[in-house]
Interface confidence: low
């Protein structure tokens, strides 16, 4: 039993939460809260929006983003892309891992131009030591942050 | 190998399924089937809609609800909130853990006023012994139950 | 530590990805890539679209499908069903495990008839040795494949 509990305590896991500083508008990935409230890191590191593996293996990685807006302006891309991407020293470019495309602003109802939608991604990927995973949303102007419960990013070793 | 198998058999996990009694209309959380069909509890308890931790640690908790309706009546909130909430003796109020907002009834198609939508939530949270997690949906009148496969609630320790 | 690492390396897990051959049009389940790119099998087998358990226990199974289309033609079902189903020698028919219904083609916006939607399913189910899990989508003509990141299917033992 002691062996089993120790195993759980050492199993890499993390849950990062959305914060006011998450949306940079710089074209970079979303940034995350790592310590306050529900956020934590256990056996994984964090760097500039990225979860960084300290131990090689298969990880279930996940992210949810809360989308919302008022109406569907003509100038706005009708397709929103939410994805998890890997950064590795072995490639110069980010590698797509898990991606969703949605058309949320078509969801405004006839009696309310306000719309909300949510995108969830989760899947198992292999990470080597030092490899990083980031979250990107295009168009990030549609991500709605509040208190860390609606947009988040996490992982655990399986 | 025996050590590893025992570890898996002891790892807390649960999957609860939607049933006719899930929707109470009382303003409380959704209630769940714990034994029949696909439902089970292993190392977690259940009480009045809540999964109760018997062992402290980090858990991946998840819920899916099937939403559906006909048209988008004016009297109906155009925003549906689906959330996982923690009850703990340390706070008088429930704590939001993972939440989604959706505007599903804007999804009726031009040739059918019937619409369906699904909301999935999942993420890692810390639970102490005795802490509880519940599922709430507002407006719960839009939750469509059938056979336990479309709306459900579960957790496992990571 | 050696004990813990061995435990992780033996823990059954898989992530299968969408490919051009995934959609058969034959009424059967979706087929998947098992080796190339992000796809892998560890302690689980694959057969004709199915993940096959080699070890009895509780598994978190998941699938995401990327849906997309142009407009909402009258001839097309306005409800899309995405589900995970179990095949077992103990029953002649497939057993529904986790299912979602969505009405995605109502999401086309006014200035782009193109719409996208994504459906994610995940939950814990019990599998005996030799039992299989498959993914079905009705109408599968709306599944949009690209590079294995948008539609996928996986599992790991919990």
């Amino acid at each position: 039993l002691i062996q089993e509990r120790r195993s759980h305590q050492n199993n890499p896991a993390a849950h990062l939460t959305g914060a006011n500083s998450s949306l940079t508008g710089s074209g970079g990935p979303l940034l995350w809260e790592t310590q306050l409230g529900l956020a934590f890191l256990r056996g994984l590191d964090y760097h500039d929006g990225a979860l960084v593996a300290n131990k090689a293996g298969y990880y279930y990685i996940y992210s949810k983003v809360q989308l919302g807006g008022v109406g569907c302006p003509l100038g706005l891309a009708s397709t929103i892309t939410h994805g998890l991407y890997k950064r590795t020293p072995r490639y110069p470019e980010e590698l797509e891992l898990l991606v969703s495309q949605q058309s949320p602003c078509g969801r405004a109802t006839s009696n309310s131009r306000v719309w909300w939608d949510s995108s969830f991604l989760g899947g198992v990927v292999h990470l080597e030591v030092g490899e990083e995973v980031v979250v990107r949303v295009l168009d990030e102007r549609l991500v709605r942050l509040r208190d860390g419960t609606r947009s988040y990013f996490g992982a655990f070793m399986v | 190998l025996i050590q590893e198998r025992r570890s898996h058999q002891n790892n807390p996990a649960a999957h609860l399924t939607g049933a006719n009694s899930s929707l109470t209309g009382s303003g409380g959380p959704l209630l769940w089937e714990t034994q029949l069909g696909l439902a089970f509890l292993r190392g977690l308890d259940y009480h009045d809609g809540a999964l109760v931790a018997n062992k402290a640690g980090y858990y991946y908790i998840y819920s899916k609800v099937q939403l559906g309706g006909v048209g988008c009546p004016l009297g109906l909130a155009s925003t549906i909130t689906h959330g996982l909430y923690k009850r703990t003796p340390r706070y008088p109020e429930e704590l939001e853990l993972l939440v989604s907002q959706q505007s599903p009834c804007g999804r009726a198609t031009s040739n059918s006023r019937v619409w369906w939508d699904s909301s999935f939530l999942g993420g890692v949270v810390h639970l102490e012994v005795g802490e509880e997690v519940v599922v709430r949906v507002l407006d719960e009148r839009l939750v469509r139950l059938r056979d336990g496969t479309r709306s459900y609630f579960g957790a496992f320790m990571v | 530590l050696i004990q813990e690492r061995r435990s992780h390396q033996n823990n059954p897990a898989a992530h299968l990805t969408g490919a051009n051959s995934s959609l058969t049009g034959s009424g059967g389940p979706l087929l998947w890539e098992t080796q190339l790119g992000l796809a892998f099998l560890r302690g689980l087998d694959y057969h004709d679209g199915a993940l096959v358990a080699n070890k009895a226990g509780y598994y978190y199974i998941y699938s995401k499908v990327q849906l997309g289309g142009v407009g909402c033609p009258l001839g097309l079902a306005s409800t899309i069903t995405h589900g995970l189903y179990k095949r077992t020698p103990r029953y002649p028919e497939e057993l529904e495990l986790l299912v979602s219904q969505q009405s995605p083609c109502g999401r086309a916006t006014s200035n782009s008839r193109v719409w996208w939607d994504s459906s994610f399913l995940g939950g814990v189910v019990h599998l005996e040795v030799g039992e299989e899990v498959v993914v079905r989508v009705l109408d599968e003509r709306l599944v949009r494949l690209r590079d294995g990141t948008r539609s996928y299917f996986g599992a790991f033992m919990v």
Epitope: L74, A77, S78, T79 | S110, N111 | G69, V70, G71, C72, P73, L74, A108, T109, S110, N111, S112, R113, V114
Partner: antibody, heavy 116, light 108 residues
Framework: QVLLVQSGAEVKKPGASVKVSCKAS????????INWVRQATGQGLEWMGW????????DYAQEFQGRVTMTRDTSISTAYMELSSLRSEDTAVYYC?????????WGQGTLVTVSS | SYELTQPPSVSVSPGQTARITCSGD??????AYWYQQKSGQAPVLVIY???KRPSGIPERFSGSSSGTMATLTISGAQVEDEADYYC???????????FGGGTKLTVL
């Protein structure tokens, strides 16, 4: 900015075919439908159909079924509309327009004259 | 087949309010869209989804829809607003566009 630039005027004999091009710039060509609308001199607007550059899906107004073909070349962000079996009443200005149901940007128009 | 009906012509004096109507049986369920077309030019979108105004369109242009009737209103019409105005909507499948016959607005 968004621009739709159409090919120049055409004169055709009855029974012939005409192919009008529409080159798009200033946006992602595959994200929006291209619609075709025509207008005879002194008459109203008449919708002919749409083509989705991403999927190559098309849908034509019933009056043009069997005579019109809408295609595209995504490599040069250009849409085409070909009308066959021309008759004198097909004499009109032909417009391409971007969008699904909100046709928000239009080409300058191409005059097609059908005359023997 | 589905039709949209507009008055052939509307006349107003400069500064007056011009109202152009468009009627169709499906308008309770469908959005109305409005175009302005000046002589020899391509149409320009002035109202979409019943009442939304694209950027660059003056505030004097507004739209509304009630029951089977959609209305384009030009508050304080100006001489440069003289043009043909077309309403359009979609058929039951949302796959086909239907134009109204057009209304010639004269600002005397």
């Amino acid at each position: 900015q968004v621009l739709l630039v159409q090919s120049g005027a055409e004169v055709k004999k009855p029974g012939a075919s005409v192919k009008v091009s529409c080159k798009a710039s200033g946006y992602t060509f595959t994200h929006f439908d291209i619609n075709w609308v025509r207008q005879a001199t002194g008459q109203g607007l008449e919708w002919m159909g749409w083509m989705n550059p991403d999927s190559d899906n098309t849908d034509y107004a019933q009056e043009f079924q069997g005579r019109v073909t809408m295609t595209r070349d995504t490599s040069i962000s250009t849409a085409y509309m070909e009308l066959s079996s021309l008759r004198s009443e097909d004499t009109a200005v032909y417009y391409c327009a971007r969008g699904g149901t909100t046709l928000d940007y239009w080409g300058q128009g191409t005059l097609v004259t059908v005359s023997s | 087949s589905y039709e949209l009906t507009q008055p052939p012509s509307v006349s107003v004096s400069p500064g007056q309010t011009a109202r152009i109507t468009c009627s169709g049986d499906a308008l309770p369920k469908k959005y109305a869209y409005w175009y302005q077309q000046k002589s020899g030019q391509a149409p320009v979108l002035v109202i979409y989804e019943d009442s939304k105004r694209p950027s660059g369109i003056p505030e004097r242009f507004s739209g509304s829809s009630s029951g089977t009737m959609a209305t384009l209103t030009i508050s304080g019409a100006q001489v440069e607003d003289e043009a043909d105005y077309y309403c359009y909507s979609t058929d039951s499948s949302d796959n086909h566009v239907i134009f109204g016959g057009g209304t010639k607005l004269t600002v005397l």
